[in-house]
């Protein structure tokens, strides 16, 4: 005997003596029986019988929201007038991906509009899109469970050379954007100071062109260009970079006075204001937040404050006059 065994007996509520099958049949003209809620939904004002003209409200379980008209009305013939209503998931569940792939940010649930980035170990790239966005109850584009990492052709080609270069005999020469970049490489968001425009470029093409001394090309972020804070900061960072005394190569990027190159990710990471060293003659006169007082800050402090998205108005380069 198992208490979990199901022999098809109808349920009995703890406080009721009768099985549901023993309840008297309801006459149609005396109202409506309880309607069937949509999947992942329930009836808020639940009862056995509803009067003609009475409304029931459909609610959704946590993590779901109602889409459509969420009220049913009891009609004189004992049926319900109900529009199309469904409970749609408001969050996406963390996708199941192959172990070699890293999900950033790593959470159990993601809200609509939130994005994830899939990355691979050094020397490998995602064999497909790397950025996915939660839309309703699914990821866009859909995440294939066979998605994996593949050897980065850039790494293979470059040998002992720097990114954007390839080995030619015993020396390193720049890759040709046309000839050497026909293979798949991850998308980067890039800014061109000449055209004052940003666009999505394959990593191989960007690095090859940068190697060929196209100094007007600036890396903004990994992944295709999408409006948002990351792009906004990328553009502001490019403007500030012209005055930076430090220009340290770091993966696809170049790190400036207010940044540190992360050894483990090969990405430039903003320092926090207290990590700025006082030295440097690149000074700015600024106004912080809603303050009316002026303050002299160095380029590192300005960069870290703007990177942290704190409100600051640059009044002019150089020390404050007062």
């Amino acid at each position: 005997f198992s208490i979990m065994e199901n022999n098809g007996q109808p349920c009995i509520n703890d406080d009721e003596e009768m099985k549901e099958v023993d309840l008297p049949e309801i006459e149609a003209d005396s109202g409506c029986p309880q309607p069937v809620p949509p999947e992942n939904g329930f009836i808020r004002n639940e009862k056995q019988l509803y009067l003609v003209g009475e409304d029931v409200e459909i609610s959704c379980l946590t993590g779901f929201e109602t889409v459509g008209y969420q009220y049913f009305r009891c009609l004189p013939d004992g049926t319900w007038r109900q529009g199309d209503v469904e409970c749609q998931r408001t969050e996406c569940i963390k996708p199941v991906v192959q172990e070699v792939l890293t999900i950033t940010p790593f959470q159990r649930l993601y809200r609509i509009g939130e994005s994830i980035e899939l990355t691979c170990p050094k020397g490998f790239v995602v064999a497909g899109p790397s950025r996915y966005t939660c839309q309703g109850n699914s990821w866009t584009p859909p995440i294939s469970n066979s998605l994996t990492c593949e050897k980065d052709t850039l790494t293979k080609l470059k040998g002992h050379c720097q990114l954007g270069q390839k080995q030619s005999g015993s020396e390193c020469i720049c890759m040709s954007p046309e000839e050497d970049c026909s293979h798949h490489s991850e998308d980067l968001c890039v800014f061109d100071t000449d055209s004052n425009d940003y666009f999505t470029s394959p990593a191989c093409k960007f690095l090859a062109e940068k190697c060929l001394n196209n100094q007007q090309l600036h890396f903004l972020h990994i992944g295709s260009c999408q409006d948002g804070r990351q792009l906004e900061w990328g553009l502001e960072r490019t403007r500030l970079s012209s005055n930076s005394t430090k220009k340290e190569s770091c993966g696809y990027d170049t790190c400036y006075d207010w940044e540190k190159c992360s050894a483990s990710t090969s990405k430039c990471v903003c320092l926090l204001p207290p990590q700025c060293f006082k030295g440097g003659n690149q000074l700015y006169c600024v106004k912080m937040g809603s303050s009316t007082s002026e303050k002299t800050l160095n380029i590192c402090e300005v960069g870290t404050i703007r990177c942290a998205n704190r409100k600051m108005e640059i009044l002019h380069p150089g020390k404050c006059l007062a």
């Epitope: 940010p105 959470q107 804070r229 540190k260 990405k267 207290p274 990590q275 990177c307």
Partner: antibody, heavy 118, light 112 residues
């Protein structure tokens, strides 16, 4: 070699005051922000306050605002923490800390014990 | 304030064994430009804390490479590939992505 040596700790009654000092050496003191971090008995670590290069900007944790004052004297290579209206929950070992490009608290002193009790 | 929950609270290990400490944040530490300010410290008995890992996975200066950090968003891990006697102490995670900076309650590592 970076060295930070705290002093000024001791036993004080609730409502009382105490001034902690931190003597810095082995680096150009005026070129760095500085901070105080504390550790209550058998408790974890807690950031207390931070000061910029010349003392023109200070930052405090909410529970000490209005009671504690962080200051510095660059000529003496010294950092201070003036603690007024002390409470029992301020009992802790107080550490002086300096940042680096790696972290906000990269270098620490050995700490000085402050006990607030009647 | 951001709460950092460390597990386990105590670890008793045999030298040479691997160890893993978890740090879970009450909110995501990934900021809107893609940076995560998560650090790991070790406080050896009778000493002040020392930096082990910064920015989730970068090794602090002079830290042996048996230490490694990983994670993103709200879940972070410190791993020691082979525990040595000198690794005994309390391990703390710390975040600086949101003000005020906060520390985890600590994980005590002792030898069997």
């Amino acid at each position: 070699e970076v060295q930070l040596v705290e002093s000024g700790g001791g036993l004080v009654q609730p409502g009382g005051s105490l001034k902690l000092s931190c003597a810095a050496s082995g680096f150009t003191f005026r070129d760095y922000y500085m901070a105080w971090v504390r550790q209550g008995p058998g408790k974890g670590l807690e950031w207390v306050a931070t000061i910029n290069y010349d003392g023109s900007s200070t930052y405090y944790r909410e529970s000490v605002k209005g009671r504690f004052t962080i200051s510095r004297d660059n000529a003496k290579n010294s950092l201070y923490l003036q603690m007024d209206s002390l409470r029992a929950e301020d009992t802790a070992v107080y550490y002086c800390a300096r940042p680096s490009t790696e972290a906000l608290f990269a270098y620490w002193g050995h700490g000085t014990l402050v006990t607030v009790s009647s | 304030d951001v709460v950092l929950t460390q597990t386990p609270l105590t670890l008793s290990v045999t030298p040479g064994q691997p160890v893993s400490i978890s740090c879970r944040s009450s909110q995501s530490l990934l900021n809107d430009v893609g940076n995560t300010y998560l650090y790991w410290y070790l406080q050896k008995p009778g000493q002040s804390p020392q930096l082990l890992i910064y920015l989730v996975s970068d090794l602090g200066s002079g830290v042996p490479n048996r230490f490694s950090g990983s994670g993103s968003g709200t879940d972070f891990t410190l791993k020691i590939s082979r525990v040595e006697a000198e690794d005994v102490g309390v391990y703390y995670c710390m975040q600086a992505s949101h003000a005020p900076y906060t520390f985890g309650a600590g994980t005590r590592l002792e030898l069997k």
